[in-house]
C-alpha cells in the first residue's frame, strides 16, 4: 500500500512514499522518511550557519547527499535550499558538515555566486551561494 | 582541456566603444563564471568583473557605468563591451576562469587581446 | 576597496638565494593567491589560498601569511624564476591585485 504525500512546498511534482513497503524510521514527528533517512524542509529563510544550527537543534544536519539511487526524492525538489556543503578553500574540495569530501559524480556543482556554501537544487545541482544569504533549509537524519 | 581565448578589435578610437569575445572550450558556461582583467602596458593586473554561470554579474566598482558584460552559453562565448575609451584604457586584456568550481583565484587563462586606444 | 602593496617593487637575487616578497592588504583577508608572469605571457596561477602551490610549482617555492600580511619565499632561487609575482584577493568586492614584485636573477 502507499500513500501519497503531497508536499507541494518542497516537490515539483507529487511524490509516493511507500509507508508499508518496508519499515522507516523513527524519524522526529511529521518528518518524511525515505529509504533509511529522514528530511525536513523548513519554510524559512536562514543565512547558512543559522540554517545548520536549526538542524544541530533537533539532532539533525542539514542536508547531505551521498547517493542518487538511496536519495532518489530529492531529484524531484523544487527551488533552491541551503545543504550541508561548504567549500574547503585550502584544498579546492567541497565537504559536508561531517568532514567528508563530495564524491565525484554526485552533484554538478555550479558557479552562481562568489560564496563558499551550496543550495541544492533539482536534479542533484549544487548552486554556489554566499554563505550569509538567507534561504529556505533541508534537514536530514539518518535513522541506521 | 580548458582552454579561453579572446578576439577583439586591436585598435579603438577615443571615446568609441570597445567589444570583446571571449570563446572558451573543455567546460561549459553554465557551470562556471568567467572573468575579465586587463593589463595597461608595464603595469600592473586590474580585475573588471565577472559573469556568473547563471548570467549574474559583478563589476569593478570603478568601471561599472563603462562595463556590460554578457554571454551566449549555446555559442561558449562571453563578452565584454566598454564605453567611452580613453588613452588609459589601454591594455592587454583578458578573460580567465577560477581553478576550479568556487574558487577565489583563476586558474586558466586566455593568452590575452591587445587594445591600442588611439586616433 | 583592499589595497594590496607588494615589496620591494624589484627584488635581485643571485642563484641558490633564499628570497622573501611581500604581499599587505589594507584589510584583514581570509587568503591570499599569487601568480607568475613572465614578459609576452599571460600570468599563471602560482600560490593560492596562502600557501598552496598551483599545479607544476616546483617545492621551492612556499607561501604564507595571515591577516593583512602575507608572503611568497623561494628557497633557492634559479634562473627560470625570474618573472613578475602578483599578489590578489578575493574577501571582498572588488577583486584586487598587488601593483607586482618583480624578480631579476644577477
Known amino acids: 500500500i502507499w500513500s501519497a504525500v503531497f508536499l507541494n512546498s518542497l516537490f515539483n511534482q507529487e511524490v509516493q512514499i511507500p509507508l508499508t513497503e518496508s519499515y522507516c524510521g523513527p524519524c522526529p514527528k511529521n518528518w518524511i522518511c525515505y529509504k533509511n533517512n529522514c528530511y525536513q524542509f523548513f519554510d524559512e529563510s536562514k543565512n547558512w550557519y543559522e540554517s545548520q544550527a536549526s538542524c544541530m537543534s533537533q539532532n539533525a544536519s542539514l542536508l547531505k547527499v551521498y547517493s542518487k539511487e538511496d536519495q532518489d526524492l530529492l531529484k524531484l525538489v523544487k527551488s533552491y535550499h541551503w545543504m550541508g556543503l561548504v567549500h574547503i578553500p585550502t584544498n579546492g574540495s567541497w565537504q559536508w558538515e561531517d568532514g567528508s569530501i563530495l564524491s565525484p559524480n554526485l552533484l554538478t556543482i555550479i558557479e552562481m555566486q562568489k560564496g563558499d556554501c551550496a543550495l541544492y537544487a533539482s536534479s542533484f545541482k549544487g548552486y554556489i551561494e554566499n554563505c550569509s544569504t538567507p534561504n529556505t533549509y533541508i534537514c536530514m537524519q539518518r535513522t541506521v | 582541456q580548458v582552454q579561453l581565448q579572446e578576439s577583439g578589435p586591436g585598435l579603438v578610437a577615443p571615446s568609441q566603444s570597445l567589444s570583446i569575445t571571449c570563446t572558451v572550450s573543455g567546460f561549459s558556461l553554465t557551470s562556471y563564471g568567467v572573468h575579465w582583467i586587463r593589463q595597461p602596458p608595464g603595469k600592473g593586473l586590474e580585475w573588471l568583473g565577472v559573469?556568473?554561470?547563471?548570467?549574474?554579474?559583478n563589476y569593478n566598482s570603478a568601471l561599472m557605468s563603462r562595463l556590460s558584460i554578457s554571454k551566449d552559453n549555446s555559442k561558449s562565448q562571453v563578452f565584454l563591451k566598454m564605453n567611452s575609451l580613453q588613452i588609459d584604457d589601454t591594455a592587454m586584456y583578458y578573460c580567465?576562469?577560477?581553478?576550479?568550481?568556487?574558487?577565489?583565484?583563476?586558474?586558466?587563462w586566455g593568452q590575452g587581446t591587445t587594445v591600442t586606444v588611439s586616433s | 576597496d583592499i589595497q594590496l602593496t607588494q615589496s620591494p617593487a624589484i627584488l635581485s637575487a643571485s642563484p641558490g638565494e633564499k628570497v622573501t616578497m611581500t604581499c599587505r592588504a589594507s584589510?584583514?583577508?581570509?587568503?591570499m593567491h599569487w601568480y607568475q608572469q613572465k614578459p609576452g605571457s599571460s600570468p599563471k596561477p602560482w600560490i593560492y589560498?596562502?600557501?598552496n602551490l598551483a599545479s607544476g610549482v616546483p617545492a621551492r617555492f612556499s607561501g604564507s601569511g595571515s591577516g593583512t600580511s602575507y608572503s611568497l619565499t623561494i628557497s633557492r632561487v634559479e634562473a627560470e624564476d625570474a618573472a613578475t609575482y602578483y599578489c590578489q584577493q578575493w574577501n571582498s568586492n572588488p577583486l584586487t591585485f598587488g601593483a607586482g614584485t618583480k624578480l631579476e636573477i644577477k
Open positions: 584589510s584583514s583577508v581570509s587568503y
Open positions: 589560498a596562502t600557501s
Open positions: 580567465a576562469r577560477g581553478g576550479y568550481e568556487g574558487a577565489a583565484w583563476f586558474g586558466y
Open positions: 559573469i556568473w554561470a547563471g548570467g549574474s554579474t
